[in-house]
Interface confidence: medium
């Protein structure tokens, strides 16, 4: 696997790696159209949770926050559907007993922000 | 930092730390509903990047294609507009000179999907 | 691992009330849209009513508009549905679940469902 060096050469000792400090990018930082999460037809709200034992520390959590989708008149519109757009990534787990510091990487889902699409089925009036 | 052991105790030889081998919650998937990329008001396609040396190596992008949001016509309506959701991500590089592999995170910008907004005004003189 | 127990169900005679509680484990139903569903013998499960995710925006199946009411307490992660009027076409066995993609979410998406309470409406 990815994590696993060539089978030619000597195993790993203790199950860990070598992680460079420093992150590459690390300044990158999202640019997204302003307000978009409430100028959205399937407008949400944000949570945010913090870790002081992960990284990023703060991890976004979206949730949309209506079912249907908000019409030209500012109404809700339950013919449509507000729904979840969601990504996987990865986030680092900081171990450490004493001076012994280790890293173990964490995939978490992340609900980004939300998208007005037509439904699957009607079953709600 | 994030990256740094207290300051009692000694230095971390040569820039690197133990990062541990397995990921936590490496099965959870993304589980969102179905095709909502074409039955968006904004609908997105798919780009997939891949590259061996990177965790995961596959990276998919978002592209909106339209500038409009999709009416119930099915016409593009351009007094709405189709906008890019982005999220930062983790990736870890693999970097090797022969049986010597190390580590590195690196910050990417995904474009995860879209969404229909009601657009700026921007007042031209 | 998410946890659903429905309880509050019984009989109950034409026009009667049932205030029908789920508490949920493993899962904090503030952060997801939840919804009620039912199903009588010999019939498939149906959807019932939902609650968003923030607030208490609601939407009802047509055959129990006006007459049954969802909400949810953030605090003891627990969702009810209040049941008026009832019929006995109401009979059936009621299960609550979150409701991942909204109204969008399908009854052959869910993986786990609790027991369910019985609600039985006698003439």
């Known amino acids: 696997t990815f994590f696993q060096k060539p089978e030619s050469c000597p195993p790993v000792p203790g199950g860990s790696m070598k992680l460079d400090i420093g992150i590459i990018n690390e300044n990158q930082r999202v640019s997204m159209s302003r307000n978009i999460e409430s100028r959205s037809t399937s407008p949400w709200d944000y949570t945010v949770t913090w870790d002081p034992n992960r990284y990023p520390s703060e991890v976004v959590q979206a949730q949309c926050r209506n079912l249907g989708c908000i019409n030209a008149q500012g109404k809700e519109d339950i013919s449509m559907n507000s729904v979840p757009i969601q990504q996987e990534t990865l986030v680092v787990r900081r171990k450490h007993q004493g001076c012994s510091v280790s890293f173990q990487l964490e995939k978490v889902l992340v609900t980004v922000g939300c998208t007005c699409v037509t439904p699957v089925i009607h079953h709600v009036q | 930092t994030f990256f740094q052991k207290p300051e009692s105790c000694p230095p971390v030889p040569g820039g690197s730390m133990k990062l541990d081998i397995g990921i936590i919650n490496e099965n959870q998937r993304v589980s969102m509903s179905r095709n909502i990329e074409s039955r968006s008001t904004s609908p997105w396609d798919y780009t997939v990047t891949w590259d061996p040396n990177r965790y995961p190596s596959e990276v998919v992008q978002a592209q909106c294609r339209n500038l409009g949001c999709i009416n119930a016509q099915g016409k593009e309506d351009i007094s709405m507009n189709s906008v890019p959701i982005q999220q930062e991500t983790l990736v870890v590089r693999r970097k090797h000179q022969g049986c010597s592999v190390s580590f590195q995170l690196e910050k990417v910008l995904v474009t995860v999907g879209c969404t229909c907004v009601t657009p700026v005004i921007h007042h031209v003189q | 691992q998410v946890q659903l127990v429905e309880s509050g169900g019984g009989l109950v005679q034409v026009g009667g009330s049932l205030r029908l509680s789920c508490e949920v484990s493993?899962?904090?139903?503030?952060?997801?849209?939840m919804g009620w569903f039912r199903q009588a013998p010999e019939k498939e499960r149906e959807f019932v009513a939902a609650?968003?995710?923030?607030?208490?925006?609601?939407r009802y199946a047509h055959f129990v508009k006006g007459r049954f009411t969802i909400s949810r307490d953030n605090a003891k992660n627990t969702v009810h549905l209040q049941m008026d009027s009832l019929k006995p076409e109401d009979t059936a066995v009621y299960y609550c679940n979150d409701m991942p993609y909204g109204l969008d979410t399908r009854m052959d998406e869910y993986e786990y469902w609790g027991l369910g309470t019985q609600v039985t409406v006698s003439s």
């Open positions: 493993g899962l904090p139903v503030s952060s997801y849209a």
């Open positions: 609650i968003s995710w923030i607030g208490g925006d609601s």
